[in-house]
Interface confidence: medium
């Protein structure tokens, strides 16, 4: 299973649930479904209050038990390390794959943290991060922001990923804006 890591804003906007959590338990494989589940301890929720309703405590995250079908395998053994997890809700359960945005909270730039905490949501309604995978590429719409990080370096490590968000400038127009300049 291969996929290009998304811009964190795309991950935020396309996910049902975005949380901060620790992986605390030993993973278990369900012998019937061949899904494995990781026990987590949620410390913050950034998106998903409405989707979850009253069941606002997520205790497990589910993923296929094989990487060949995009199963996520958690490598860290540090149970106190916090991770940003952006996933989908299926039947009230949080599901992730290799293609989901899952990253140590400490590895995120301050700008990205600010994005997940409050800013990315502003761009979800109107704006689209549009990946530019090969030159030439052009904007399809005024509401698109061209994402060129992959042309230069790893998509997660690029300047646009780590420091910028695609936000409305005026109706029908979105531009890259610095997350540093946003109110903390």
């Amino acid at each position: 299973c291969t996929c290009v890591p998304p811009h964190p804003q795309t991950a935020f906007c396309n996910s049902d649930l975005v949380i901060r959590a620790k992986f605390v338990g030993t993973p278990e494989v369900n012998q019937t479904t061949l899904y494995q589940r990781y026990e987590i301890k949620m410390t913050k929720m950034y998106k998903g209050f409405q989707a979850l309703g009253d069941a606002a405590d997520i205790r497990f995250v589910y993923t296929p038990a094989m990487e060949s079908v995009c199963g996520y395998f958690h490598r860290s053994h540090n149970r106190s390390e916090e991770f940003l997890i952006a996933g989908k809700l299926q039947d009230g359960l949080l599901h992730i794959t290799t293609c989901s945005f899952v990253a140590p909270w400490n590895s995120l730039s301050l700008a990205q943290r600010r994005g997940f905490t409050k800013t990315y949501t502003v761009g979800c309604e109107e704006c689209t991060v549009f990946p530019c995978l090969s030159i030439p590429c052009k904007l399809q719409s005024g509401t698109h922001c061209l994402w060129t990080d992959q042309l230069l370096q790893g998509s997660e490590k690029g300047f646009q990923s780590r420091h910028l968000a695609c936000l409305p400038r005026e109706p029908g127009l979105c531009t890259w804006q610095s997350l540093r300049s946003q109110i903390a």
């Epitope: 993973p27 494989v29 012998q31 019937t32 296929p64 038990a65 094989m66 060949s68 395998f73 490598r75």
Partner: antibody, heavy 116, light 108 residues
Framework: EVQLLESGGGLVQPGGSLRLSCAAS????????MSWVRQAPGKGLEWVSA????????YYADSVKGRFTISRDNSKNTLYLQMNSLRAEDTAVYYC?????????WGQGTLVTVSS | EIVLTQSPGTLSLSPGERATLSCRAS???????LAWYQQKPGQAPRLLIY???SRATGIPDRFSGSGSGTDFTLTISRLEPEDFAVYYC?????????FGQGTKVEIK
């Protein structure tokens, strides 16, 4: 007591087809993922395919993808492996095994020989 | 693709001796997805250890598993005559159900 009994093996020509069956008893069949594992004469074990309890998810080794199809009939407690476009290198004892990711019960195997 | 390499290929020991079998993965394997099997001639394999260190039902306590990451070990503390067989390690997940090539434990 868990029992798995394979059948359907035999001699087949290259390019031919064969359908293996595995009759299961002694456990709740529909709640267990099942797998096929094979062993060529004098060689080691090679996983072939797996299927979830409901039959909704199937998995294959690259060596058989597109040629073999795993299925199950939970009403008959039976696992199947349909093998098409058979090659000489498919010659092996085929075992059905209960569960995954580890295989806690195995059948005694059925020999498939692909030869002209 | 992940590869599991078992060593040694053959282990020649006497009953009562300690056997140490190694399984090395080409990349990190999830501990809960690693298992060991025993196979005797003409028989189906039998699950010995799952989750790298948990003994399967009915397996004597002379069998133990350990390890994490890329290095795993099966230890038989005192070999009994019925322990002479081929042993396979197996992982699930990175590439489905990959087996090692096996270690034969034979009577010296």
């Amino acid at each position: 007591e868990v029992q798995l009994l394979e059948s359907g093996g035999g001699l087949v020509q290259p390019g031919g087809s064969l359908r293996l069956s595995c009759a299961a008893s002694g456990f709740t069949f529909s709640s267990a993922a099942m797998s096929w594992v094979r062993q060529a004469p004098g060689k080691g074990l090679e996983w072939v395919s797996a299927i979830s309890g409901s039959g909704g998810s199937t998995y294959y080794a690259d060596s058989v993808k597109g040629r073999f199809t795993i299925s199950r009939d939970n009403s008959k407690n039976t696992l199947y492996l349909q093998m098409n476009s058979l090659r000489a290198e498919d010659t092996a004892v085929y075992y059905c095994a209960k569960s995954a990711p580890m295989f806690d019960y195995w059948g005694q195997g059925t020999l498939v020989t692909v030869s002209s | 693709e992940i590869v599991l390499t078992q060593s040694p290929g053959t282990l020649s020991l006497s009953p009562g001796e300690r056997a140490t079998l190694s399984c090395r993965a080409s990349q990190s394997v999830s501990t809960h997805l690693l298992a060991w099997y025993q196979q005797k001639p003409g028989q189906a394999p039998r699950l010995l250890i799952y989750g790298a260190s948990s003994r399967a039902t009915g397996i004597p306590d002379r069998f133990s598993g350990s390890g994490s990451g890329t290095d795993f070990t099966l230890t038989i503390s005192r070999l009994e005559p019925e322990d002479f067989a081929v042993y396979y390690c197996q992982q699930w997940g990175l590439t489905p159900a990959m087996f090692g090539q096996g270690t034969k434990v034979e009577i010296k």
